[in-house]
């Protein structure tokens, strides 16, 4: 079957996100991928969205992330916009209202996004073949 347009948007947004480093991409998030053996695909998407929402809710106006220069501030705003777009599209793919995120493991946001990108590219290659 054809790949969902949302999936293409997610990969595109992840490509943009992983290209840019900001003051906040080294901050840690819950690593939902560390032990996701018994998790459905929809649950994974839902939990990834939950992690992203937690991150931008906490750090949107975080002075550590805003930086001291206009360029740092601008980059941080762009990061938040991309994370919100990603969150929105992941919720759309998941089709679930809520999901628990209880893992103790942590990873940097940067690594989390790279892992998510790998998963999404794998999904895309399956649905486009």
């Amino acid at each position: 079957h054809k790949c969902d347009i949302t999936l293409q948007e997610i990969i595109k947004t992840l490509n943009s996100l992983t290209e840019q480093k900001t003051l906040c991409t080294e901050l840690t998030v819950t690593d939902i991928f560390a032990a996701s053996k018994n998790t459905t695909e929809k649950e994974t998407f839902c939990r990834a969205a939950t992690v992203l929402r937690q991150f931008y809710s906490h750090h949107e106006k975080d002075t550590r992330c805003l930086g001291a220069t206009a360029q740092q501030f601008h980059r941080h705003k762009q990061l938040i916009r991309f994370l919100k777009r990603l969150d929105r599209n992941l919720w759309g793919l998941a089709g679930l209202n809520s999901c628990p995120v209880k893992e103790a493991n942590q990873s940097t946001l940067e690594n989390f996004l790279e892992r998510l990108k790998t998963i999404m590219r794998e999904k895309y290659s399956k649905c486009s073949s």
């Epitope: 943009s16 601008h74 705003k77 762009q78 938040i80 777009r85 919720w91 759309g92």
Partner: antibody, heavy 120, light 107 residues
């Protein structure tokens, strides 16, 4: 300061074409998604189209799909709307708008609008 | 497309009044809702985004709440400059849609 200025509006006959421009200043166009929103006389707001920051993704309202094309020239900091096969119901004030600083697909900066009248 | 229904379509109020405008979505849109104010002959102005976040420079008498399908815009104490038309907008998915507007008039 941050500003959007539309141009290119006017009166045109049904079936003809028109190209609107939106010049951005005070920010880098290539960092933001950009939209066109229109408002028919005495009516509410209608979203028309969006182009992503890098120009690679565009979406359109069903009412203009196949007739309107959004594009951007980031080197000129300018957004465009090519309108073909115009109809009377396309008569409206056309606004270009920038996506929000903190959220995608909302509009935090608007132009002053340019009037498009489609009439024979 | 997601439909947004605002109520009331118009209302009359006095300076100092507390006013609430509601916006209902035809399906769940999480918190992907914004509110705008528009005065005659002018472009709209963003007031609230993400359902409840106040846009920079907007007076604190404006507030937004809600999630899912039901949202409200509240003006805690109307000022003379607040008489205008208000629109809600969803950005949960394309096509982006607006409510039909609520016209706020002086009583």
């Amino acid at each position: 300061q941050v500003q959007l200025v539309e141009s290119g509006g006017g009166m045109v006959q049904p079936g003809r074409s028109l190209r609107l421009s939106c010049a951005a200043s005070g920010f880098t166009l290539s960092s933001y998604g950009m939209h066109w929103v229109r408002q028919a006389p005495g009516k509410g707001l209608e979203w028309v189209t969006v182009i992503w920051y890098d120009g690679n993704n565009q979406y359109y309202a069903d009412s203009v799909k196949g007739r309107f094309t959004i594009s951007r020239d980031n080197s000129k900091n300018t957004l465009y709307l090519q309108m073909n096969s115009l109809r009377a119901e396309d008569t409206a004030v056309y606004y270009c708008a920038r996506e929000g600083s903190w959220s995608p697909d909302i509009f935090d900066i608007w132009g002053q609008g340019t009037m498009v009248t489609v009439s024979s | 497309a997601i439909q947004l229904t605002q109520s009331p379509s118009s209302l009359s109020a006095s300076v100092g009044d507390r006013v609430t405008i509601t916006c209902r979505a035809s399906q769940g849109i999480s918190s992907y809702l914004a509110w705008y104010q528009q005065k005659p002959g002018k472009a709209p102005k963003l007031l609230i985004y993400d359902a409840s976040s106040l846009e920079s420079g907007v007076p604190s008498r404006f507030s937004g709440s809600g999630s899912g399908t039901d949202f409200t815009l509240t003006i805690s104490s109307l000022q003379p400059e607040d008489f205008a038309t208000y629109y809600c907008q969803q950005f949960n998915s394309y096509p982006i849609t607006f409510g039909q507007g609520t016209r706020l008039e002086i009583k």
